[in-house]
């Protein structure tokens, strides 16, 4: 066993080459230098090494970088990559988004892994914020990405990164993410005019508060149904049935297929069936004629 | 007439923290956004951030991000703006201003504080 | 970082009109609002959306925009519109307010 650690005769390695694939473990362990292996990183991917050849290289760069590797090696790092562990990525300092990218890449196609997870959150905090070119490079790679983050998390995403964000980036939020998404898309779209700045924000609205929505219903939008189900509920309880309907437009036949699920079934509830019966769509569960509507919440707070 | 009255004048050392209150007398001051403007002597305005009515999203110029902390009390209808670290730069008028006006993309600043005058000295 | 540049002052007779430009690049392509200060006291917003007026605003103060300048124009300046004013834009992830033009009423 002594005898192994010492590298045989001609065996050195003067580079990464294809030729190290026929060596041992300890032969590598032995005969690969680890500064020339940190020089030449970027060979590595391009040589079908065994999973435990590349324990062993991992080793090696452990060893001459135990405080963790400079970014010039992860930058290079390919599939020795799905090697690291969480604790091994905190070390690092990656403050490149082509670093970022080429590890993701490493990645491509399988879930977040925790390393990646790992990966991600030093990157941002490295930046302070999560900008619109990261953004734009996370949510490529990871759709849900965005609705991964806490509401703290999403307080930090600058305005200007909501440009980046598709419809599907969202479809996994939820109401407490979107309450904190909206207000940002609603300062980074405010320079567009009605109908542009309509089809940029309504895949936040599910963030909008009564006072937006009846605004938005001053504006012509025809919202579709499928915006209008994703409505926060209380955000939507308020409105009136002319607001609803100029809210959707043309629309607000969908309204029939909808009424026995919420937000459209609270709503139905809230509203008075003589003011239903104007839209024409046969919607049932009003409030009846010459009944006094009392808004306890008003009443618990004057008591 | 709706107003926002905001917290007294401070004196502060360099490095210090300092926290301006400001509270609206209105009833429906939980369903604005809220933002801070400051204004050192004779200087021009300077935007510093906002708040969304419900408090959970805040928004910061960079200049002041890491520095900044802007929070709401809603059921006292008061909105908090802290400012840590202070250098002698930071001494200014700073003014909460309510956006209560028209519209789904509108930001404009409708009602006004009267302004907390925070002196950064040693 | 954005800038938004005005002339530091403007000079007017009582009834004249006045103009203030604030130039910045591209600032046609967002809103402009303007704000009043008087000394001693907390701005006022006078033009918000380019040209649109608050409620309480007088009709004497009318704003547009575009290009690379927006402006407001006082026309038939009173000696109570002596004061600071200041136009502001959205540009990415800040408000960013002009120099400040100070209106003086002859």
């Known amino acids: 066993e002594v005898e192994k650690t010492a590298c045989p005769s001609g065996k050195k390695a003067r580079e990464i080459d294809e030729s190290l694939i026929f060596y041992k473990k300890w032969e590598l362990e032995a005969c690969v230098d680890a500064a020339l292996l940190a020089t030449q990183m970027d060979r590595v991917n391009a040589i079908p090494f065994t999973y435990e050849q590349l324990d062993v290289l991992k080793h090696k760069l452990d060893e001459l970088y135990p405080q963790g590797y400079p970014e010039s090696v992860i930058q290079h790092l390919g599939y020795l990559f799905l090697k690291m562990s969480p604790e091994d990525i905190r070390k690092w300092n990656v403050t490149s988004l082509e670093t970022l990218k080429a590890l993701l890449e490493v990645n491509k196609g399988h879930e977040m892994s925790p390393q990646v997870a790992t990966l991600i959150d030093r990157f941002v905090k490295g930046r302070g914020q999560l900008d619109k070119d990261t953004l734009d490079t996370l949510t490529a790679f990871y759709p849900g990405y965005l609705c991964s983050l806490s509401p703290e998390e999403l307080s930090s995403v600058p305005p200007s990164s909501i440009w980046a964000v598709r419809p599907q980036d969202l479809d996994t939020c939820d109401p407490r993410q979107l309450d904190v998404l909206y207000p940002k898309a609603r300062l980074a779209f405010q320079n567009m005019n009605g109908s542009e700045y309509f089809v940029k924000i309504q895949s936040f609205l599910g963030g909008a508060p009564t006072e937006d929505l009846k605004a938005l219903s001053q504006q012509n939008v025809s919202m579709d149904l499928a915006t209008f189900m994703k409505l926060r509920t209380d955000a939507v309880l308020p409105l009136t049935v002319a607001e609803v309907q100029k809210l959707l437009g043309p629309h607000v036949e969908g309204l029939k297929a909808e009424e026995r699920h919420r937000p459209v079934r609270d709503w139905i509830l809230r509203q008075r069936q003589d003011d239903l019966d104007t839209l024409g769509l046969g919607l049932q569960g009003g409030i009846p004629n010459g009944y006094l509507v009392l808004d306890l919440s008003m009443q618990e707070a004057l008591s | 007439e709706v107003q926002l009255v905001q917290s007294g004048a401070e004196v502060k050392k360099p490095g210090a923290s300092v926290k301006v209150s400001c509270k609206a007398s209105?009833?429906?001051?939980?369903?604005?956004?809220v933002q801070w403007v400051r204004q050192a002597p004779g200087q021009g305005l300077e935007w510093m951030g906002i708040?969304?009515?419900?408090?959970?999203?805040?928004t910061y110029a960079q200049k002041f991000q890491g520095r900044v902390t802007m929070t709401r009390d809603t059921s006292t209808s008061t909105v908090y703006m802290e400012l840590s670290s202070l250098r002698s730069e930071d001494t200014a008028v700073y003014y909460c201003?309510?956006?209560?006006?028209?519209?789904?993309?509108?930001?404009?600043?409708?009602?006004w504080g009267q302004g907390t005058l925070v002196t950064v000295s040693s | 970082s954005y800038e938004l540049t005005q002339p530091p002052s403007v000079s007017v007779s009582p009834g004249q009109t006045a103009s203030i430009t604030c130039s910045g690049d591209k600032l046609g392509d967002k809103y402009a609002s303007w704000y009043q200060q008087k000394p001693g006291q907390s701005p006022v917003l006078v033009i918000y959306q380019d040209n649109r007026r608050p409620s309480g605003i007088p009709e004497r103060f009318s704003g547009s925009n575009s290009g690379n300048t927006a402006t407001l124009t006082i026309s038939g300046t009173q000696a109570m519109d002596e004061a600071d004013y200041y136009c502001q834009a959205w540009d990415s992830d800040t408000y960013v307010f002009g120099t400040g033009t100070k209106v003086t009423v002859l």
């Open positions: 708040i969304n009515p419900s408090g959970v999203s805040t």
């Open positions: 201003a309510e956006t209560r006006g028209p519209g789904f993309n509108y930001f404009g600043m409708d009602v």
């Open positions: 209105g009833d429906t001051f939980n369903r604005y956004y």
